[in-house]
């Protein structure tokens, strides 16, 4: 979001009916409230970065994120018998990704059409609310998953109904928290008509200068409370997990667990480095610059960072892959265009052959419903 200069015809500074037009003159419209942007921001809004690069990234995220998270949610809900806490957190993670990704066709169209929002105020607010909601939901569910993975290593006790209920309770609390913290995004006017560019932006231009301070405080609070604190918990969980795995006994099964744990850690680290850290950092810097200087020199970086934050919807399936045995099987089979039933039948026939011949070189993967490393 950049700060728009509000030229209000309402007689009150910095607020007015942006979409309202009083009459048409020639080929243009007479606007009741006009917002002006600086030249650099205008060049970003009309340049290749926002009209070509962003739609490409969002298309990739949509094409990869929708089926993979859709399949993950289906696996966790209907193909995983034991609903371990990890499964519950991953199901929520997949749901958060889906709720964000389903709106991407509108986002893609918006950027392709030169950052011109034609779908109305309400849809813009929903898109933005879900966009940020997904990012903060992902951080929190990833934190829960990371802490839970560490807890499993420290306390390798069997699955209990109580643990699952706690995980469900925590998940509901997270959804409620995210709903509450994203309320300002639904309340604030997000669509702004820019007469100079003849476009209506969605979230890319800040409608009211009076909101600049509020937006800075809002994103700073989120960065501290819903990014830094969970990031610290996640990092702590993985550092402790690595220590535990280093000191544990070294059999073949432990080695497999360790490798998968390391892959999970690398994936989560990549997610933080690519998706969460740049976006949260630049949200704060960007709004600080607008608040203090009236314009942001990091606008292009901020746009790219927010765009990259959506890649978490593509990276999350890798987390499911390293944590869930069931998802791993379904993902492998989906990529090989085979059904799990066919694979199970193959395994049954292979097992029977193995027993009849007594000496078989076949080794097939198990299709147990266990959801651990």
């Amino acid at each position: 979001t950049i700060q728009g200069t509000n030229r209000s015809s309402k007689g009150r500074s910095l607020i007015g009916k942006v979409d309202g037009t009083s009459h048409v003159t020639g080929k243009g419209v007479t606007v009741e409230t006009v917002f002006s942007v600086d030249e650099f921001s205008a060049s970003v809004l009309t340049g290749k970065l926002t009209t070509v690069f962003l739609p490409i990234v969002y298309t990739i995220v949509f094409v990869v994120g929708l089926p993979s998270n859709g399949m993950a949610l289906w696996v966790f809900l209907f193909r995983t018998k034991k609903k371990h806490p990890a499964v519950i957190y991953m199901a929520n993670l997949a749901l958060a990704d889906l709720l964000s990704v389903i709106w991407f066709p509108l986002k893609i169209a918006y950027h392709i059409h030169g950052n011109n929002w034609i779908y109305g105020e309400a849809l813009c607010n929903v898109l933005i609310g879900f966009f940020y909601g997904n990012m903060y939901c992902s951080i929190l569910f990833m934190t829960c998953l990371s802490v839970q993975r560490y807890w499993v290593i420290v306390n390798p006790m069997g699955h209990s109904r109580k643990k699952a209920n706690i995980a469900i309770g925590i998940s509901l609390a997270i959804w409620l928290l995210i709903l509450l913290v994203t309320i300002p995004l639904y309340v604030v006017k997000q669509t702004i008509f820019i007469p100079a560019l003849n476009i209506t932006t969605c979230h890319d231009v800040l409608p009211e200068q009076l909101l600049v301070g509020d937006m800075f405080n809002y994103f700073l609070s989120l960065a501290i409370g819903v990014f830094l604190f969970p990031a610290f918990l996640t990092a702590s969980a993985y550092v402790l997990m690595i220590r535990m795995l280093r000191s544990s006994a070294m059999d073949e099964n432990s080695e497999k667990k360790r490798k998968r744990a390391i892959k999970l850690i690398v994936t989560v680290l990549a997610m933080y480095l690519i998706c969460f850290t740049p976006s949260n950092l630049l949200l704060v810097v960007h709004y600080f610059l607008i608040k203090s200087q009236g314009q942001s020199h990091v606008y292009a970086l901020y746009i790219v960072a927010l765009c990259l934050s959506t890649l978490n919807s593509c990276i999350d399936p890798f987390v499911y892959y390293f944590v869930s045995h069931d998802f791993r099987d379904h993902a492998k089979n989906a990529l090989l265009c085979r059904s799990v039933r066919t694979v199970k039948q193959m395994q049954v026939s292979l097992t029977s052959k193995k027993h009849s011949r007594k000496s078989s070189s076949y080794s097939s993967s198990s299709t147990t419903v266990k959801t651990s490393y």
Epitope: V29, D38, A196
Partner: antibody
Framework: QVQLVQSGAEVKKPGSSVKVSCKAS????????ISWVRQAPGQGLEWMGV???????YYAQKFQGRVTITADESTSTAYMELSSLRSEDTAVYYC?????????????WGQGTLVTVSS | EIVLTQSPATLSLSPGERATLSCRAS??????LDWYQQKPGQAPRLLIY???SLATGIPARFSGSGSGRDFTLTISSLEPEDFAVYYC????????FGGGTKVEIK
């Protein structure tokens, strides 16, 4: 070089309308906005309205409903029409070039057109 | 609407002297303030834009400073052609002009 040449002085009766022209040269009207500013005798400057290169317009609340700004790209001319004239509208009317972005000033001005409203 | 208050209304100085003109905004306008010079019977001429940037063709004796609410136009050494009326204008929220400061020969 950049120039804004305005039409000549006008004497109008109260209740009538006046249309002031501003011919641009040295730049394209489609790439710039034209703002209109007036100055009553012995008074300060007062912003009236703007027309962007794409035809979009915006008027100061004070003049809304009375002022109409238009532009003809083929002749590189911008127009400002003020209706329902009253004696208080006696002023020098200026057109000024503006890049259309927040970080740009009114860098070139027309020579001004004196409009006298008298019965 | 943002109100700009210029002071003093009149500044009586001699050629070669330093002139300091003030412009105060009713609210924060960051650096979005321009200065114009107007001589009798002429159109305003841009001197300084965005608080401190010197416009093309303007002598270096003119300088601008300030941000937020308080701004200053300084003429380091007055030349005979500098005696005129000076206006500040904000373009942060709407376009409004100050009342003007007349710099006259003492």
């Amino acid at each position: 070089q950049v120039q804004l040449v305005q039409s000549g002085a006008e004497v109008k009766k109260p209740g009538s309308s006046v249309k002031v022209s501003c011919k641009a040269s040295g730049f394209s009207l489609s790439s710039y906005a034209i703002s209109w500013v007036r100055q009553a005798p012995g008074q300060g400057l007062e912003w009236m309205g703007v027309i962007w290169g794409n035809g979009n317009t915006y008027y100061a609340q004070k003049f809304q409903g009375r002022v109409t700004i238009t532009a003809d790209e083929s002749t590189s001319t911008a127009y400002m029409e003020l209706s329902s004239l009253r004696s208080e509208d006696t002023a020098v009317y200026y057109c000024a070039r503006w890049r259309g972005y927040k970080d740009y000033p009114f860098d070139y001005w027309g020579q001004g057109t004196l409009v006298t409203v008298s019965s | 609407e943002i109100v700009l208050t210029q002071s003093p209304a009149t500044l009586s100085l001699s050629p070669g002297e330093r002139a300091t003109l003030s412009c105060r905004a009713s609210q924060n306008i960051y650096k979005w303030l321009d200065w114009y010079q107007q001589k009798p019977g002429q159109a305003p001429r841009l001197l300084i834009y965005n608080a401190y940037s010197l416009a093309t063709g303007i002598p270096a004796r003119f300088s601008g400073s300030g941000s937020g609410r308080d701004f200053t136009l300084t003429i380091s050494s007055l030349e005979p052609e500098d005696f005129a009326v000076y206006y500040c204008q904000q373009h942060n929220s709407g376009w409004t002009f100050g009342g003007g400061t007349k710099v006259e020969i003492k």
